[in-house]
Amino acid sequence: DPASKSRSCGEVRQIYGAKGFSLSDVPQAEISGEHLRICPQGYTCCTSEMEENLANRSHAELETALRDSSRVLQAMLATQLRSFDDHFQHLLNDSERTLQATFPGAFGELYTQNARAFRDLYSELRLYYRGANLHLEETLAEFWARLLERLFKQLHPQLLLPDDYLDCLGKQAEALRPFGEAPRELRLRATRAFVAARSFVQGLGVASDVVRKVAQVPLGPECSRAVMKLVYCAHCLGVPGARPCPDYCRNVLKGCLANQADLDAEWRNLLDSMVLITDKFWGTSGVESVIGSVHTWLAEAINALQDNRDTLTAKVIQGCGNPKVNPQGPGPEEKRRRGKLAPRERPPSGTLEKLVSEAKAQLRDVQDFWISLPGTLCSEKMALSTASDDRCWNGMARGRYLPEVMGDGLANQINNPEVEVDITKPDMTIRQQIMQLKIMTNRLRSAYNGNDVDFQDASDDGSGSGSGDGCLDDLCSRKVSRKSSSSRTPLTHALPGLSEQEGQKTS
């Protein structure tokens, strides 16, 4: 029909100009469309250059929409991570501050002379929580071994205790249980609590990382063509008012995001495991009551050592022989004051409950993020048709969209009518991210059972008082803690917000 040939390109001109492109490219009226490589080759208002520009623009717009959706999810995960991380670190810092404030008065030189050992223990716990490759049980055992050496010397200043005698003392330690049940209790509870806390926070970090990396995966050329056809070919073909048919849009985006949808199963597994591990935040071995109460076990341990001093000394002498007496040394130490214990169970502050309930709700909300992405983008970003089925843009003309909607994931795109997807070539970045999700899920499942996945051989029995028998590789750094320069000034180690004194830790 000659009349249709001379239809004006005014609407296309307006839309094209609004996108920032030069209007000189746009024909005044429709032209023959044999030159079109993506859109159907009927009469058109688009030149080759316009088609190329709009194809690039539609590709960029989809990538931007994808990044925007990812950014929202990333921001949510980052906020969660920061909130939990702040809370867990606050619990540990609080415990250390309490120790620094109360132990000098409660234990005198038994604390001040060993302040460095306590500082180092908290530093190691912090490092472990942050993901350092430390064996927590051995870290604790080594701490107790070192502390025993130091305290035994302090409780017997009249004795000459050379290194070989201290080595012997260390070998006896496990059988003697010098610190009572505190080391074992702390080890069992702290291992479970720290493993749960750190794996949960790591889970949030991995989830966020996966989203960030997947958002950077480029869309392939076949996807670009399909998106151009979906978004701008209606304009080129003179039906700019026709919006894409919903099922047509879903098929295009399911094809474009086929690899991303394959994240779904492992993503759900990860989020389920994260929700599950929050069960370990409560109760006597829970994160809140354990991490915030490390100092109470330390106090119990020192008290137990003082209470058992005479029995312990007798058994050590029995096992290691009579040490020499320093003729110029002071007499045996007087019985020390008994450190008053703070209540073991920290009353829950309510902060963690609030954090957990928010996190659970938000994690449930994003469980189907990857498979709902095509639908979300279509409904939120693609201005879908709400008209009756035969009035929407189907990729060829205004009319009904007949093909069925494809399933989710790469394998289901074998017959996608809109995007040619090679199902034999999965995207390697996304496969790597699926593997990261699997690994993190295994960590969380392991953590749920109280195990650190890096140290599956860790046994759950024994006293935990430490052997002191030589030096386990990389685990002997819990060393002497001397007092600050005046024996009257207890050493308070620098934490954010605390003033630095001489002899303090400096960051």
Partner: antibody
Framework: QVQLKQSGPELVKPGASVKISCKAS????????MHWVKQSPEKSLEWIGE????????TYNQKFKAKATLTVDKSSSTAYMQLKSLTSEDSAVYYC????????????WGQGTLVTVSS | DIVMSQSPKSMSMSVGERVALSCKAS??????VSWYQQKPEQSPKLLIY???NRYTGVPDRFTGSGSATDFTLTISSVQAEDLADYYC?????????FGAGTKLELK
């Protein structure tokens, strides 16, 4: 056997900085605190500070807090000390020293690094 | 800071003589005192720790004694190879401090 090998002598200009190293071998580097000691003819031995290679925690002698910065590189089992704003008073031999066990007793010493500050 | 005072500054001895080097702390340091030997052009070497424990490989002519504020390093029979500077140091409190040293010379 335990060895601490320090970097060679340094001749530096006043106001400059210098970073000296101490490479440890023969033991678990992160297992023992590393200390730094200054020896000058006038002041005999002066303790500068210590670092826990496992955690990076440091403790300084107040006198050297603005002068020295202690760091470690765990991957190469090396401890470092940077001295800044050097003056002739900083001319000395600097030693790294490792504790015997957990008692602030230095059983192992590096061979020393002579730092000369001169214009 | 705890001040460690050594005396005498130097002493001349003959081989075979007994020598006692003194170290006094400005405040109680328990038995947290070590003794170091430094020969010319060498690094210091540990002799005694914990005021009176001889370190591995140190000849038994070296003996440490004392506690609280008064400490002594005794060489029962001086040998030619003992010509060196001797330093005491305390590890009781921060900052760790050393004495100014005693130079042992041979007559």
């Amino acid at each position: 056997q335990v060895q601490l090998k320090q970097s060679g002598p340094e001749l530096v200009k006043p106001g400059a900085s210098v970073k000296i190293s101490c490479k440890a071998s023969g033991y678990s580097f992160t297992g023992y605190y590393m200390h730094w000691v200054k020896q000058s003819p006038e002041k005999s031995l002066e303790w500068i500070g210590e670092i826990n290679p496992s955690t990076g925690d440091t403790t300084y002698n107040q006198k050297f807090k603005a002068k020295a910065t202690l760091t470690v590189d765990k991957s190469s089992s090396t401890a470092y000390m940077q001295l800044k704003s050097l003056t002739s008073e900083d001319s000395a031999v600097y030693y790294c020293a490792r504790e015997k066990r957990d008692d602030g007793v230095f059983a192992y010493w590096g061979q020393g690094t002579l730092v000369t500050v001169s214009s | 800071d705890i001040v460690m005072s050594q005396s005498p500054k130097s002493m001349s001895m003959s081989v075979g003589e007994r020598v006692a080097l003194s170290c006094k702390a400005s405040e109680n340091v328990g038995t947290y005192v070590s003794w170091y030997q430094q020969k010319p052009e060498q690094s210091p070497k540990l002799l005694i720790y914990g005021a009176s424990n001889r370190y591995t490989g140190v000849p038994d002519r070296f003996t440490g004694s004392g506690s609280a504020t008064d400490f002594t390093l005794t060489i029962s029979s001086v040998q030619a190879e003992d010509l060196a500077d001797y330093y005491c140091g305390q590890s009781y409190s921060y900052p760790l401090t050393f004495g100014a040293g005693t130079k042992l010379e041979l007559k």
